[in-house]
Interface confidence: low
Amino acid sequence: EAHKSEIAHRFKDLGEQHFKGLVLIAFSQYLQKCPYEEHIKLVQEVTDFAKTCVADENAENCDKSIHTLFGDKLCAIPKLRDNYGELADCCAKQEPERNECFLQHKDDNPNLPPFQRPEAEAMCTSFQENPTSFLGHYLHEVARRHPYFYAPELLYYAEKYNEVLTQCCTESDKAACLTPKLDAVKEKALVAAVRQRMKCSSMQRFGERAFKAWAVARMSQRFPNAEFAEITKLATDVTKINKECCHGDLLECADDRAELAKYMCENQATISSKLQACCDKPVLQKSQCLAEIEHDNIPADLPSIAADFVEDKEVCKNYAEAKDVFLGTFLYEYSRRHPDYSVSLLLRLAKKYEATLEKCCAEGDPPACYGTVLAEFQPLVEEPKNLVKTNCELYEKLGEYGFQNAVLVRYTQKAPQVSTPTLVEAARNLGRVGTKCCTLPEAQRLPCVEDYLSAILNRLCVLHEKTPVSEKVTKCCSGSLVERRPCFSALTVDETYVPKEFKAETFTFHSDICTLPDKEKQIKKQTALAELVKHKPKATEDQLKTVMGDFAQFVDKCCKAADKDNCFATEGPNLVARSKEALA
């Protein structure tokens, strides 16, 4: 229903703590360079204003839309043009164009230093002195680096962060307690960031219909006992919620997400038998738990899908009468039977089914034409299954680091024009799929692998879109979202690429590498590996193994030397010479 004051309505629904957190996230995602102190000042002003509207909904400006209120706040920032350049031009526009303009200026790769976790003692001190400010900094730092992070989920991670610090800061060995727990939160949050970016990409590029199809498939897998119309209702709600968050309507998004959780918990009987444990939790944890819920058991007596979608003589009539509903029902029926498939694969099958009906229902004998459609799914199913098998075997053989390197070589050969830092980031993330998915039971591997890879490749596409350099990447990124992963997998060595000149300085290292944490050391080595491939795109696996092994020994030797600097200075040029020779 309509409310006199939208901001008062959201404040009352969300409560002050969540309201402030969401406003901070919103401002941090729009103006990514502003310091925390500046944002928190704005948050307080907006909160005070919301309180006046709660007290009197007829007070001045309380009837304005949240976009208008937020936009006016952002546009009042002094020196906006100095810090943000053309983003300041947005302020000349009226709503809703002004908000659209802000969204277009979100930067997926802001020029910010990597978020450094403070040392355990220092972290606990500042947390204990002012927990609210500490967690506010966390929200700000994550939100500005991930401008599409799903806001209500970020509040959940802040809550987790709070729990970990509350527990560990009383321990004698704070670091031993904090490190693994915060690493786990960070890992989950980073995966959540790329998954949500994919959802926003889907919404931005292909619209609500495409996103809703994704949601129908996902919900049908999770809730195979729910009826189609129930799934449709859930998918419609999830689509609305994600549209709001991707569009910067974070208060409405969080409020609607809480409403959906409430609805699901009130209607467990018609959705899933697995919800009860989630429904006993407080709001943020409840929504998160429902989002991660395990699949319900598939009904035992499901008939063959062929009966309604192939053998029924009325297939073309049903399709013609309500195409979207008929295809939606097909997607629902197929997905609820296949929790072992990725959503991307299910959407490919639905697309294939749709194309078959489009073709066959225009012909003389439709049943004869579409009669073999289910058999024609086979190659579409086999392709990702083989991908999982070969990649998991490679991961088991090489381990995570070695697997990342194999992926890095593969992708540098496919798209050598892409910047080395982007290739290294993508390969490291793609390589993590092994640790994340290959250890799972067989039935869970395919959905885990393919849907994760799709999200990581979306990140590659988003970064490449900013500065397009590879025609092949542009081609894969421009097509349908569900075809991206197969498109990238099918890419081979780019024959049009002119190899990079061999620059000795690219392969020159100093003693500072010795003190780097393991992760940073790996990145240095992987940067060198990508550069080697760019120099010799057709280098064999053995050649690359030789050079990288040599390089690892060189680093190891010099880091153990008494005079490290001297070792790097003298041994470095020898390494470069040997590498050139090995790759000749």
């Epitope: 009826e227 189609f228 119309a229 449709t232 209702k233 209607n267 018609t270 008939p303 309604d308 509903v325």
Partner: nanobody
Framework: QVQLVESGGGLVQPGGSLRLSCAAS????????MGWFRQAPGKEREFVAA?????????YYADSVKGRFTISRDNAKTTVYLQMNSLRAEDTAVYYC??????????????????WGQGTLVTVSS
Amino acid sequence: QVQLVESGGGLVQPGGSLRLSCAASGRTFIAYAMGWFRQAPGKEREFVAAITNFAGGTTYYADSVKGRFTISRDNAKTTVYLQMNSLRAEDTAVYYCAADRSAQTMRQVRPVLPYWGQGTLVTVSS
């Protein structure tokens, strides 16, 4: 949106049969579970039968009609049927067709359903 119109009611002798039809208009018929309810004079409306959204879907029945009544649907004709056999005097009522997102919710004591028909009278009497 779905509009529902029932037909097929009438006077029948005990032990006889009737087939009720409910024609739905609206392009999203196959998105809905369909059901039949009845209301006898001076009594509350009660659940009779429901079927999930797709042809050959799962069916649910009230204990009092199990084995005698059969619910079915034809999505091509956007129609739901209630075949009533071995009719008894206590089956006399106005029979209503209904549509909802879920066949299971229809079985609740007083379901608040989004779509109802106007009803068709069934009288079982000798």
